[in-house]
């Protein structure tokens, strides 16, 4: 009897990665491509339909478009190998390979997709009034994670975490956590993205910098801008007396632009 075999039918792949799933079929001597039929399906979605020596892309489900292909060179070795690139969470499930070559048979293969919170972006900023540092960690993954903040002496600290859906993919979570703390230069803090259970956690290290770059600290602004603002005040008072109201509108617009550009510069020290 014609029998398909699989050397492995449980696959795990990381989100965004590539996977090749294989079904083996018996080939004696030379493969006759025109006698071979290969179907790959996932639940109700058609992925590959290989008939009469070619793939019929018209039937391919849109979610696999440009991402799934049958590796033709492997067919001659008796392997129906489905390659999926840029794997998504929605690709997880049970795949079925059905092969007809004289006889016919099928096998089921399960694919699990995991998305660790690996690429953790971080930011450190300072509140100009309280001198308190705000530490932020953000990452995307699946399933939901909580964020644990710890200090270098292993104290667990209380942060605030928000979870939203990712813009990249519906099932992916975007987890952002902030910690407000009084800290000194070179102190080290850790944010750990932790999912339930004993599986792998992902941690980022945040080091409090010696001095946040100008103009992150408003106090630095005032030290530099103080004398300038005083001088500007005098000039403006004189100008007010000497110039017409219409000309002043231009100065105000210019100042408004200036203030806004300073605000933009204030988007803090950032590391990824």
């Amino acid at each position: 009897a014609f029998t398909i075999t699989v050397s492995k039918d449980l696959y795990v792949v990381e989100y965004g990665g590539n996977v090749t799933m294989e079904c083996k079929f018996p080939v004696e001597k030379q493969l006759n491509l025109f006698a071979l039929i290969v179907y790959w399906e996932m639940e109700d979605k058609k992925i590959i339909q290989f008939v009469n020596g070619k793939e019929d892309l018209k039937v391919q489900h849109s979610s696999y478009s440009q991402r799934a292909q049958l590796l033709k060179d492997q067919l001659f070795l008796g392997k129906a190998a489905l390659q999926i690139t840029d794997v998504r969470l929605q690709d997880a499930g049970v795949y079925c390979c059905l092969i007809g070559y004289g006889g016919a048979d099928y096998k089921r293969i399960t694919l699990k997709v995991h998305a660790p919170y690996r690429n953790i972006s971080q930011r450190i900023s300072v509140d100009p009034v309280t001198s308190e540092h705000e530490l932020m960690c953000q990452a995307e993954g699946y399933p939901e994670a909580e964020v644990i903040w710890t200090s270098s002496d292993h104290r667990v600290l209380s942060g605030k975490t928000t979870i939203t859906n990712s813009n990249r993919e519906e099932k992916l979570f975007n987890v952002t956590s902030t910690l407000n703390i009084n800290a000194t230069a070179n102190e080290i803090f850790y944010c750990t993205f932790q999912r339930s259970g004993p599986e792998e956690n992902n941690t980022a290290e945040l080091v409090i910098p010696e001095r946040l770059p100008v103009p992150a600290s408003e106090r630095t602004h005032f030290m530099i801008l103080g004398p300038f603002l005083l001088l500007l005040g005098v000039v403006l008072a004189v100008t007010f007396c000497l110039k017409k109201h219409g000309r002043m509108m231009d100065v105000e617009k210019c100042c408004t632009r200036d203030r806004n550009s300073k605000k933009r510069n204030d988007i803090q020290f950032e590391e990824t």
Epitope: K8, L10, V12, P143, S196, P198, E199
Partner: antibody, heavy 118, light 107 residues
Framework: EVQLVQSGGDLVKPGGSVRLSCVAS???????MSWVRQAPGKGLQWMGT????????HYPDNLMGRFTFSLDTAKNTAYLQLNSLRAEDTAVYYC????????????WGQGTLVTVSS | DIVMTQTPLSLSVSPGEPASMSCRAS??????LHWYRQKPGQSPQVLVK???QSISGVPDRFIGSGSGTDFTLRISRVEADDLGVYYC?????????FGQGTKLELK
């Protein structure tokens, strides 16, 4: 903290049925759930898996037909329905959360004993 | 089905001494093998995943190795808390199967 709390174990007559429950807390059903049984003084036997959304189930051939898995995601509960029970089905039944990064069991329930005897 | 065979079935070790146990698969399973410990009266607990990958919260005394058909779990220094039955499990193919277990006792 992840917890799987099981109930429903009972003394059942041969040919009878029982439904085991497994209530999950500390996580949502974004994970596949498996069932594993252990006959008294014996090793572990994998009974199958139900996917996170319940869209697919896997049973070993020797158990197919008599046992059914289901999920109630609203109640965060997994169920195992055991039918046409035989004396050799006497065992501690464990519900287990499959890991998200592979096919190993990350968390186990405390187990519940089903005794099949007349 | 893939058959998993564990040796020895029983192992007696003094605290502080190393211990080693084996698991053999009836066909190649790459690195798709996991180790569990079941203490008396308790549920099993995963110790090592994918032949050699460590598990968060598990002491680094538990070291897994092997690939293909032959696998080993080594405990570098046995502690009193380590007694119980150790199981291997393959996750290469359905149905997932467990070994029959190795019972670790303390001398």
């Amino acid at each position: 903290e992840v917890q799987l709390v099981q109930s429903g174990g009972d003394l059942v007559k041969p040919g009878g049925s029982v439904r085991l429950s497994c209530v999950a807390s500390g996580f949502t059903f974004s994970y596949a759930m498996s069932w594993v049984r252990q006959a008294p003084g014996k090793g572990l036997q994998w009974m199958g898996t139900i996917s996170d959304g319940g869209s697919y189930t896997h049973y070993p051939d020797n158990l197919m037909g008599r046992f059914t898995f289901s999920l109630d995601t609203a109640k965060n509960t997994a169920y195992l329905q055991l039918n046409s029970l035989r004396a050799e089905d006497t065992a501690v039944y464990y519900c287990a959360r499959e890991s998200y990064d592979g096919y190993y069991v990350a968390n186990w329930g405390q187990g519940t004993l089903v005794t099949v005897s007349s | 089905d893939i058959v998993m065979t564990q040796t020895p079935l029983s192992l007696s070790v003094s605290p502080g001494e190393p211990a080693s146990m084996s698991c053999r698969a009836s066909q190649s399973i790459s690195n798709n093998l996991h180790w569990y410990r079941q203490k008396p009266g308790q549920s099993p607990q995963v110790l090592v995943k994918y032949a050699s990958q460590s598990i968060s919260g598990v002491p680094d005394r538990f070291i897994g190795s092997g690939s293909g058909t032959d696998f080993t779990l080594r405990i570098s220094r046995v502690e009193a808390d380590d007694l119980g039955v150790y199981y291997c499990q393959q996750s290469n193919s359905w149905p997932q199967t467990f070994g029959q277990g190795t019972k670790l006792e303390l001398k």
